[in-house]
Structures are given as structure tokens and as C-alpha cells.
């Protein structure tokens, strides 16, 4: 195992190399499980000086019974059987959540000793022939210097002030509810509530992801796994908070829209443009009608100015529009907007933020929607206290600025937030929250107890599966004599038979051959890897075990290194791929240098524009110059000028 830092934000990690084929088979069994015992997925491994004996079950609680996945103008039946929740066997109070894709677990594991995060190794490590496929690190080893950036990952005060004023301009639409509707529905609902004591405590979400988010995570499965882990993370935080007597607030995904890379050119896709400021990005989300949802979020992979990781409209009990359950209405700029919205990004200053930071960002932005402004005052910002005892517990979720995510309070709401949120919940949750219940047949995902799921009769285009409107014993079951249903996976034909052994179910990539159906399951099997050390990513890297994960240096038994300016390197070299002899930094030199000419024949391999350079102090531009991140000139962050071009007029560089 490697005891070195994973990237500039994660101080220490260990590698995991359990058998992925075995876990993949167990996942397939759990998916088809009939017996109670087979429903559990077991994963055992040793890391960080302890044993992890995970017992996980498919998680059906995060997706509503009306759940749909929309992608490129299609509403798909989507199988989320790869999402799991569980615990460490024998460890009380432990909890795990994540996904199993191609036999690899990705997610988080909460233990008595803190939370561990598990991610694919190639997401971080691009310069080793890895003896492991995944990395695991402890929350204490996340050292996130920007935390929430200069403004808590939120926009600065002037942006919120502008938003607050705008929220006051909404025009209420008076809609008359017919009298008989009151009579018919009102008492019935009240009676139902009294008899079952069910409470409206679930906020249903619409999550959209833009093409850049898809580009980073690569597949629909991986995107849904990310959405799931974010929702699970905030669900855990809100469920365990007592909002002045209102308890068990939970979240459920009602609909997902995935914009794939194909949507980048679609003129109807509002998020297609590569460079959109953070306020404009939120506005684009708000211009859609989100009346069917409690909240509507867009997840992206964009590097917004000033270290902003998210933005959301702040809810209020009355007198102002915005936040949970807000309906679409007309505002002062003459546009109809839904202000039950927010956005988050997983990128900051050119790097991807750790999941923990992103989860807290999501909780923070949703906190705004629920009615909490940023924390202020000594009671609610203990991290600013001169008293060391208070200071060491850190600040709460709604703190405006830097939060490391590893202190006791970082995952909790302050009393200030609780007071604000409880007032908004009191007033608004009956407008759109629903009673929490398990997802059922009809949501397009094959779940526990279902053989298939092609949706309701108006959606089901499947000759193989009984739709959700059928009687109890038949719905979500395969029709007699049918082998499979396309809702189970891409290797089932519309004629309800497994596709033949030669049929393609996944395109090939730089490092993996195309996925080919195996003839006996509806799922697309894992792809065969291309040979190790095949060039990839425009010749800057090589394939390792089917992933574009190693540096081109490895092809010649070398290690990648950073040509840093302190080495007296020519500034031009800062954006070259540089190699060194293993464990010998003194030999670090550009691929174009005389030193490595026998390997690269004098050919200089350059980093991709946007890559970090000079030990993360800058990024490479299109001229292959390393631009310092906070230097003046073209990178100046232009404080307080997000999406306000008038302010730019007076800025000289």
C-alpha cells in the first residue's frame, strides 16, 4: 500500500485490490435474489489498520415510485440496482452507502472512528502501474484548503443581496380551487393522517446533470451513483436533525435528467454553453417550470469564479419567494421562474473536490432553500471563537466561509439555522412534501421483488414485462415464456430474448474494448481491457487494467514528475509532461529533453490545457504557459463582479 497523498486535497490513502469479478457476480446474484440471504451483498477487505466486513442491500429508498430518468429527449426505464446501503457487520451505528459498478464499490462508510471514502483509483492516480483498483481514505485526511472558497463555496454577500431583492418581486397567481374539491379531499386527507399518523416529511427532488458532469463521470450509471450518494448524504444530515419538533425530514429523487455529451449541441438544452457564470447558471435552472417538485437542482463540473461551489435561492416563511415548494411565477424582469432551485459544481480552481466537500456543499445549498441564511453571531459561528474549547468543534453547515468538513459541527445545523428552517418548514412543507414510502413498481427501476419494471401503462413500450397498472400478482413480472426485459439491461432484445454473444452493448474507449453481451444475462458485462501501456489521452497517459490511469513515463519504466520552477526549469517546461527515474526526483526532466531522447526521440509531450502545473500553483494555458492561479492579469478573479458586466467596465488589469 502507498502511504502518500492522493492529491492536493487528500493527505493519505490506501489502495484496495479485492476481487472485482467476485463482487460483480455477487451483485448479479443480489439483483436476481429470491431468497432473503441472497439479497445481501458482502464485501470484505482490510485497510487503515482495520477490517471492513460490509453487508449491503439494494437501496430502494432514494428513488420515488414515479422515478424517471430522462436523457436526450427519451424517458428511460432505468435500473438502479447498483445502488446499495448497508453497514459493517457487527459494528453498531455503522452505515455504508454507495454503488457497485463493474465489480467495484464506490461510496462512503461511516464507522465509530469516522467516515471512510472509497473511489476508483484512476480518478486520482495517473502515474503508477497500480497494484490496486480503488482508493480508500479517512475524512480526517481530507485537507481542503478552499473549503467552501472565500465565500463558503457560495456567492458573496452582494450576490445574495441582489437575489433577495429579486425574490420580493414575484407576482402571486390566484388559483381558485373548486369548492367540491375542498369537500372531497380535505377531510379524507385529515382522516388518513390521523389513522396512519404518517407525516409529510419527504422533499421530492428533480436532479438534472449537464453534459460536463456526464463527461467527467462517463456513464449514466456513474452519474446516477453520484446523484444517489449526494442525496443519501444530505438525507442522513436532515433526518438526524430536530427542526424544533419537526423530525425525520428526508429526500427522494422523483426525476433525473441526464444531459449527455450528445446534448452539448442541442439548441433546446439551456446548459449547453461551455462558459456560464454561476448566477446565470442558476437562472437557467430557474427558467424551467419545477412545480412538480419540492426542489430542482442542476449538478455540473464547471470551475466557477471565486471558488464558488454552489448557489441557491433562500427560502422564507412569507413575504418573499424562493426555496422549497415555491411555484413558478412572474418576476420583475418579466420572466416566469421557479425559485425552488439550486446548483452545485464538483470542480474548484481546476481540481475536482472530494465527495465529502461536495456532499456538504449540497447540504449547504439545500439549507438555503429550506430557509437558512449564512450563520452569523458568536452562538452560531463557534469556529471564530477565541475560546479554544468552542473553536475546536468548528463551524456549522451554513457557515459562510471556509469549512474543512472534518470538525464535529461541520455536518450539523446551528441553532440559528434550525430556528430559520423550522419556521419555513412549518409554513411550507404541507404545500409539496409527501409521506415517505418505499419506491414501488412503476418507477422504471428493477427493484427488490421485481423481475422487471417498464413503468406504467402509458410509458411501457415493453412486450416482455407486465406494466405497473396490472393486477398485484402480475405487475413488474416477466410475461409467460419471456426470457428477459429491456428494463433489466441493454443485452435484452425488444423480443424479450437475451441478445446473442456477439452483440455490442458498450462503445470502446481509449483503454477498453467494446462491451459484448454474453448471451445469458440482460446486463452488459465488463469490457475487456486493451493491453497495458497502450497510449491514451492524446499520448500523455497509458492504459492500466482498462483505465487511462498511468503516465506515458511508465511505458519506459519511469515515473511522472512535476517540472517545477524552483528546479531552475525553463518556464516553458512547466507545461511539459516530465519524467524521472523511479524515486529519484533529481532526474526529473521534460519528455523533450536530451535526457529522455532515447524514449521520446526529442518529441515534447505537453500537458492538456487546464492541467495543473508548477506543483498546483497554476494551470497550463493553450500557449503551454503555466499561469499562476491568483496572479493578476487574465486570471484575476474580478471580485464581486459575477455576471454583472457593468462592474467590469472599470476594472483595469
Amino acid at each position: 500500500q502507498y502511504g502518500n497523498p492522493l492529491n492536493k486535497y487528500i493527505r493519505h490513502y490506501e489502495g484496495l485490490s479485492y476481487n472485482v469479478d467476485s463482487l460483480h457476480q455477487k451483485h448479479q446474484r443480489a439483483k436476481r435474489a429470491v431468497s432473503h440471504e441472497d439479497q445481501f451483498l458482502r464485501l470484505d477487505f482490510h485497510a487503515h489498520g482495520r477490517h471492513f466486513n460490509l453487508r449491503m442491500k439494494r437501496d430502494t429508498s432514494l428513488f420515488s415510485d414515479e422515478f424517471k430518468v430522462e436523457t436526450s429527449n427519451k424517458v428511460l426505464d432505468y435500473d438502479t440496482s447498483h445502488i446499495y446501503t448497508g453497514h459493517i457487520y457487527g459494528e453498531e451505528g455503522s452505515f455504508s452507502h454507495g454503488s457497485v459498478i463493474d465489480g467495484r464499490f464506490e461510496g462512503f462508510i461511516q464507522t465509530r472512528g469516522g467516515t471512510f471514502y472509497v473511489e476508483p483509483a484512476e480518478r486520482y492516480i495517473k502515474d503508477r502501474t497500480l497494484p490496486f483498483h480503488s482508493v480508500i481514505y479517512h475524512e480526517d485526511d481530507i485537507n481542503y484548503p478552499h473549503k467552501y472558497g472565500p465565500q463558503g463555496g457560495c456567492a458573496d454577500h452582494s450576490v445574495f443581496e441582489r437575489m433577495r431583492k429579486y425574490q420580493m418581486t414575484g407576482v402571486e397567481e390566484v388559483t381558485q380551487i373548486p369548492q367540491e374539491e375542498h369537500a372531497a379531499n380535505g377531510p379524507e386527507l385529515l382522516r388518513k393522517k390521523r389513522t396512519t399518523s404518517a407525516e409529510k416529511n419527504t422533499c421530492q427532488l428533480y436532479i438534472q446533470t449537464d453534459h460536463l458532469f456526464f463527461k467527467y463521470y462517463g456513464t449514466r450509471e456513474a452519474v446516477i451513483a453520484q446523484i444517489s450518494s449526494h442525496v443519501k448524504a444530505i438525507d442522513t444530515i436532515y433526518q438526524t436533525t430536530d427542526f424544533s419538533g419537526i423530525r425525520n425530514i428526508s429526500f427522494m429523487v422523483k426525476r433525473i435528467r441526464i444531459n449527455t455529451t450528445a446534448d452539448e449541441k442541442d439548441p433546446t438544452n439551456p446548459f449547453r454553453f461551455p462558459n456560464i457564470g454561476v448566477e446565470k447558471f442558476l437562472e437557467l435552472n430557474s427558467e424551467q417550470n419545477h412545480d412538480d417538485y419540492c426542489l430542482a437542482y442542476v449538478f455540473t463540473d464547471r470551475d466557477f469564479d471565486d471558488g464558488v461551489l454552489g448557489l441557491a435561492w433562500v427560502g422564507a416563511p412569507s413575504g418573499s419567494s424562493g426555496g422549497i415548494c415555491e411555484k413558478s411565477k412572474l418576476y420583475s424582469d418579466g420572466k416566469k421562474k421557479s425559485l425552488n432551485t439550486g446548483i452545485i459544481t464538483v470542480q474548484n480552481y481546476g481540481s475536482h473536490v472530494p465527495p465529502k466537500v461536495s456532499h456538504i456543499t449540497f447540504a449547504h445549498e439545500v439549507g438555503h432553500n429550506f430557509g437558512s441564511p449564512h450563520d452569523s453571531g458568536t452562538e452560531c459561528t463557534p469556529g471564530e471563537s477565541k475560546n479554544l474549547g468552542q473553536k475546536e468543534n468548528g463551524n456549522y453547515i451554513m457557515y459562510a466561509r471556509a469549512t474543512s468538513g472534518d470538525k464535529l459541527n461541520n455536518n450539523k445545523f446551528s441553532l440559528c439555522s434550525i430556528r430559520n428552517i423550522s419556521q419555513v418548514l412549518e409554513k411550507k412543507r404541507n404545500n409539496c412534501f409527501v409521506e415517505s414510502g418505499q419506491p414501488i413498481c412503476g418507477n422504471g427501476m428493477v427493484e427488490q421483488g421485481e423481475e422487471c419494471d417498464c413503468g406504467y401503462s402509458d410509458q411501457c413500450k415493453d412486450e416482455c414485462c407486465f406494466d405497473a397498472n396490472q393486477p398485484e400478482g402480475r405487475k413488474c413480472k416477466l410475461k409467460p415464456g419471456k426470457q428477459c426485459s429491456p428494463s433489466q439491461g441493454p443485452c435484452c432484445t425488444a423480443q424479450c430474448a437475451f441478445k446473442s454473444k456477439s452483440e455490442k452493448c458498450r462503445d470502446d474507449s481509449d483503454c477498453a474494448r467494446e462491451g459484448i453481451c454474453n448471451g445469458f444475462t440482460a446486463l452488459c458485462p465488463a469490457s475487456d481491457p486493451k493491453p497495458n501501456f497502450t497510449d491514451c489521452n492524446r499520448h500523455t497517459q497509458v492504459c492500466i487494467n482498462g483505465q487511462c490511469a498511468g503516465s506515458i513515463c511508465e511505458k519506459y519504466g519511469l515515473e511522472e514528475c512535476t517540472c517545477a520552477s524552483s528546479d531552475g526549469k525553463d518556464d516553458k517546461e512547466l507545461c511539459h509532461v516530465c519524467c524521472m527515474k523511479k524515486m529519484d526526483p533529481s532526474t526529473c526532466a521534460s519528455t523533450g529533453s536530451v535526457q529522455w531522447s532515447r524514449h521520446f526521440s526529442g518529441r515534447t509531450i505537453t500537458l492538456q490545457p487546464g492541467s495543473p502545473c508548477n506543483d498546483f500553483r497554476g494551470y497550463c494555458d493553450v500557449f503551454m504557459r503555466c499561469r499562476l492561479v491568483d496572479a493578476d492579469g487574465p486570471l484575476a478573479r474580478l471580485k464581486k463582479a459575477i455576471f454583472s458586466p457593468e462592474l467590469y467596465e472599470n476594472i483595469a488589469e
Epitope: 461551455p274 462558459n275 490545457p609 493553450v622 486570471l635
Partner: nanobody, 123 residues
Framework: EMQLVESGGGLVQTGGSLRLSCAAS????????VGWWRQAPGKERDVVAA????????DYVDSVKGRFTISRDNAENTVYLQMNSLKPEDTAVYYC????????????????WGQGTQVTVSS
């Protein structure tokens, strides 16, 4: 929405000169970093030169240094590319690009692009 219109392209002999113009609509042009890219037949679009908002920083790709000069006139909402000592390998469609976030321009992902103007250098 910003619109960029290039002009000034044409056919020229080796060693000759051309001056390309990029006219921008929108009164906030001064807020944008602007660059010139070119695309030769069958090749990828590559950067040529770029200029910051205040004109105090210009960049050129090695192959045009000393021959091409980028400049801007904010009063006229125009950016120029003066091309001297032209060579056959300079033959390409030249595009103007701009972005309010300079970082996007400098990492090759500008938001706004013009339609391009053809430059042909004959030997």
C-alpha cells in the same frame, strides 16, 4: 449575446501581409479577453494569439512570434491580427474567439466564436 464577425482574409503571396479584424457587438466588449485561432484543412483548430482586456498582456504561439501582432481598439469594439511575412503554412480559416472569463479563453474553451475568414498564402 455577443456576436463576433471576422473580416480581412484573402489570397496573398508568400512574404505578403494581411490585417484581420474581429468586430464585436455588445457594449461590454471591454470585459472580454479575445483570441485568434486557425484551422488548416484536415487539422484541428489551434490557437494563434490572445489579448487580455486591458491590452497589457498578449500571447503568441511560437510559429507566429515576431510575424503576427494582436491588438485591440475598445472604442471601436474591434480586435486586430496584423500578419506579416506570411508563409504557405499560414493558410487556414482564422477564427476570432472571446470570453468574459479569461481562464476559459486560455484553456481553449471560449464561449463566443466568429464564423471565420479564409486566409490563403500561395507560393
Amino acid at each position: 449575446e455577443m456576436q463576433l464577425v471576422e473580416s480581412g482574409g484573402g489570397l496573398v503571396q508568400t512574404g505578403g501581409s494581411l490585417r484581420l479584424s474581429c468586430a464585436a457587438s455588445g457594449r461590454t466588449f471591454t470585459s472580454y479577453c479575445v483570441g485568434w485561432w486557425r484551422q488548416a484543412p484536415g487539422k484541428e483548430r489551434d490557437v494563434v494569439a490572445a489579448i487580455t482586456r486591458g491590452s497589457n498582456s498578449t500571447d503568441y504561439v511560437d510559429s507566429v512570434k515576431g510575424r503576427f501582432t494582436i491588438s485591440r481598439d475598445n472604442a471601436e469594439n474591434t480586435v486586430y491580427l496584423q500578419m506579416n511575412s506570411l508563409k504557405p503554412e499560414d493558410t487556414a480559416v482564422y477564427y476570432c474567439a472571446a470570453d468574459i472569463n479569461c481562464r476559459n479563453l486560455y484553456t481553449g474553451r471560449p464561449e463566443y466564436w466568429g464564423q471565420g475568414t479564409q486566409v490563403t498564402v500561395s507560393s
